[in-house]
Amino acid sequence: ALLPAREATQFLRPRQRRAFQVFEEAKQGHLERECVEELCSREEAREVFENDPETDYFYPRYLDCINKYGSPYTKNSGFATCVQNLPDQCTPNPCDRKGTQACQDLMGNFFCLCKAGWGGRLCDKDVNECSQENGGCLQICHNKPGSFHCSCHSGFELSSDGRTCQDIDECADSEACGEARCKNLPGSYSCLCDEGFAYSSQEKACRDVDECLQGRCEQVCVNSPGSYTCHCDGRGGLKLSQDMDTCEDILPCVPFSVAKSVKSLYLGRMFSGTPVIRLRFKRLQPTRLVAEFDFRTFDPEGILLFAGGHQDSTWIVLALRAGRLELQLRYNGVGRVTSSGPVINHGMWQTISVEELARNLVIKVNRDAVMKIAVAGDLFQPERGLYHLNLTVGGIPFHEKDLVQPINPRLDGCMRSWNWLNGEDTTIQETVKVNTRMQCFSVTERGSFYPGSGFAFYSLDYMRTPLDVGTESTWEVEVVAHIRPAADTGVLFALWAPDLRAVPLSVALVDYHSTKKLKKQLVVLAVEHTALALMEIKVCDGQEHVVTVSLRDGEATLEVDGTRGQSEVSAAQLQERLAVLERHLRSPVLTFAGGLPDVPVTSAPVTAFYRGCMTLEVNRRLLDLDEAAYKHSDITAHSCPPVEPAAA
């Protein structure tokens, strides 16, 4: 075996020392005679040592001994000892006691022979065995004074060879991770949890991660066990983006022909039933009413115009009932109602005129007289030397209950080419020109249009008391929605509990699956914030789709175009959710169409307003938006613009 050079020299030096042993002893006797018993000169000392280095080392110190103890002739024992020790440079021992094996006296010098693990001239320096090839250790080498030892990283143990390490399988201990899954790793182990959970080393269990604290959502965040959901301000026109964290605008995906005609007057703008136009005519010269206009509607009922004085004097109201013209009139306190002519709510333009003649009123449709009514008096009433006539369009200047026969005054209709009293009317034209809300869609079809900016609501009851007295009342919610959406997100139908500010039920369009966090176009049926069922829908194809929802004790179904949706809850969860719905239905609820009131975004899967055409049937009854308790003025009750034709 080959030894390193340093060790080799240490090994050889003692042998060398033994070769000089005899010579050294002889030299010691010679020194005794020449310089201890006698006083010696430098030359005599040179003869003893036979070399200059030792002589040069010895002689000055020899003179020091004389100075200290006197000359040899004084026979001071201290002198003899002093001189005898001078040539032995290992006395006193200059080498480090811990690290030295032996001290070798040399010519005016010494050599410290070190023990293994020590080095340096005096063997006082620890040799770092770890600095070369890690001391032969596989992992950790620990240097010690004069020695070293190997050890292993946490998770490993030292093999019997004292140098290599082997992995400890911590998972062999069933308590290593507690409730969590244990995975052994080289030198370690990991306690694993499902996504959305994090391991708690203190509790040795998986705990839900509150992702909401990490600020993942742009707007509202709701944490759930193992997951989270982000919500966007639907009422503000926002929905979740592709990343399911940020929000983006709800944009139309189907272009509707919403262009308006500046030369038209929309009669359905005021949901309150108040007139859209109020005109005051005043003349010095007695004048008769002449009114002519083109008219278009799909609405079966509502008021076209009123002409006359205050409600107790003389007036006429031209209205529509069951699609036919109706004339209500009051002359000097006596009221009458006449209805005649063809059904005119077919959605096509026709010319209607009202003419006050000497003793009768003539109503014409497309220049054909459909009513001729004898009257006693004039509509223009004299007052302080002037003749007065109030004319209102799309409503009456008093409450509809004060009519001869009550009528729903709201009329989703359109007028153009109007002419009042044979005069040019710049006032209305100018007003309409600058106010798009007073204008009609250029083209309309049957249906109701929800522009994505408002809702309507009704006060409907869903509880049914059976004929057998004493039995529990049952409940039922059956909704059929004929929809032609213009956007992929929005509430079609919902129930709202004002007292609890909760959304007991909602049916909506949504463009993602919230639990799978997957973008997909769906119809969702939900009780409060829990989705009961989902069904795919091709929402942006410009076609009409039929969404049917049926909920009653014990069952909930969702269908889109005749195909049943997939349940999102277990049978037990469904029963629990239906019980929640029933509890709500026993208290006052409002029925919402096209949107929700200002509720928290977490109240329902969707809070955005619906955009597109829709007609709703609830419990086998068609909902008429003119009959709603409230309707946003931009929702058109009986007309809907068509889908824009695709560009060639």
Epitope: R280, F281, K282, R283, L284, Q285, P286, T287, R384, G385, L386, L421, N422, G423, E424
Partner: antibody, heavy 116, light 107 residues
């Protein structure tokens, strides 16, 4: 569109008569009455009265009863104002204006100067 | 006969100033008040008709308020073309009567 065009300025001597015209166009003449308004130099507006274009019946305010006459010729859709026995204080601009309870359409005005 | 008292008879203002003219009637005329602007050599122009209704094409800086016997006409920020005479006219009863007029001059 509605137009009311009046006859030109008149310079008359005191005691003379003057007849000024107001020609209407752009609407059915008999559907609206015709008003007459006076404005003396540097003064305000005064309503003189009106004429029923259906019947031809005039109505005058108290101040303008007597020497002032409103008349019509429906065949040429024209209304007239005649002032007899002119006085210096009759010097004014005379306007015709269509009846709408208030006055939207006006003639351009006719200046009548009475000076010896 | 309803008499109208219009004030002030004249006022000097700078461009951009607010102008307020009042008209007080001797009887209650509801809101049957009208306001006219007249420039030299021209017929009056109707700015506001009954019911404080701004006429088509009239700038929105012109407005009026009032009902009964007290009426106010306002120019929110006078423009160079607004220097003219202004009249109120009641159309509640015959005879129709005008106010004496207000001359709005450049300061």
């Amino acid at each position: 569109q509605v137009h009311l065009v009046q006859s030109g300025s008149e310079l008359k001597k005191p005691g003379a008569s003057v007849k000024i015209s107001c020609k209407a166009s752009g609407y059915t003449f008999t559907n609206y009455g015709m008003n007459w308004v006076r404005q003396a130099p540097g003064q305000g507006l005064e309503w003189m009265g009106w004429i029923n274009t259906n019947t031809g019946e005039p109505t005058y305010t108290e101040e303008f009863k007597g020497r002032f006459v409103f008349s019509l010729d429906t065949s040429v859709t024209t209304s007239y104002l005649q002032i007899s026995t002119l006085k210096a204080e009759d010097t004014a601009v005379y306007f015709c204006a269509r009846d709408e309870g208030w006055f939207v359409y006006w003639g351009q005005g006719t200046l009548v100067t009475v000076s010896s | 006969e309803t008499t109208l008292t219009q004030s002030p008879s004249s006022l000097s203002v700078s461009t951009g100033d607010r102008v307020t003219i009042t008209c007080i009637t001797s009887t209650d005329i509801d809101d049957d008040m009208n306001w006219y602007q007249q420039k030299p050599g021209k017929p009056p122009k109707l700015l506001i008709s009954e019911g404080n209704t701004l006429r088509p094409g009239v700038p929105s800086r012109f407005s009026s308020s009032g009902s009964g016997t007290d009426f106010t006409f306002t120019i929110s920020s006078t423009q160079p073309e607004d220097f003219a005479d202004y009249y109120c006219l009641q159309t509640d009863s015959v005879p129709l009567t005008f106010g004496q007029g207000t001359k709005v001059e450049i300061k």
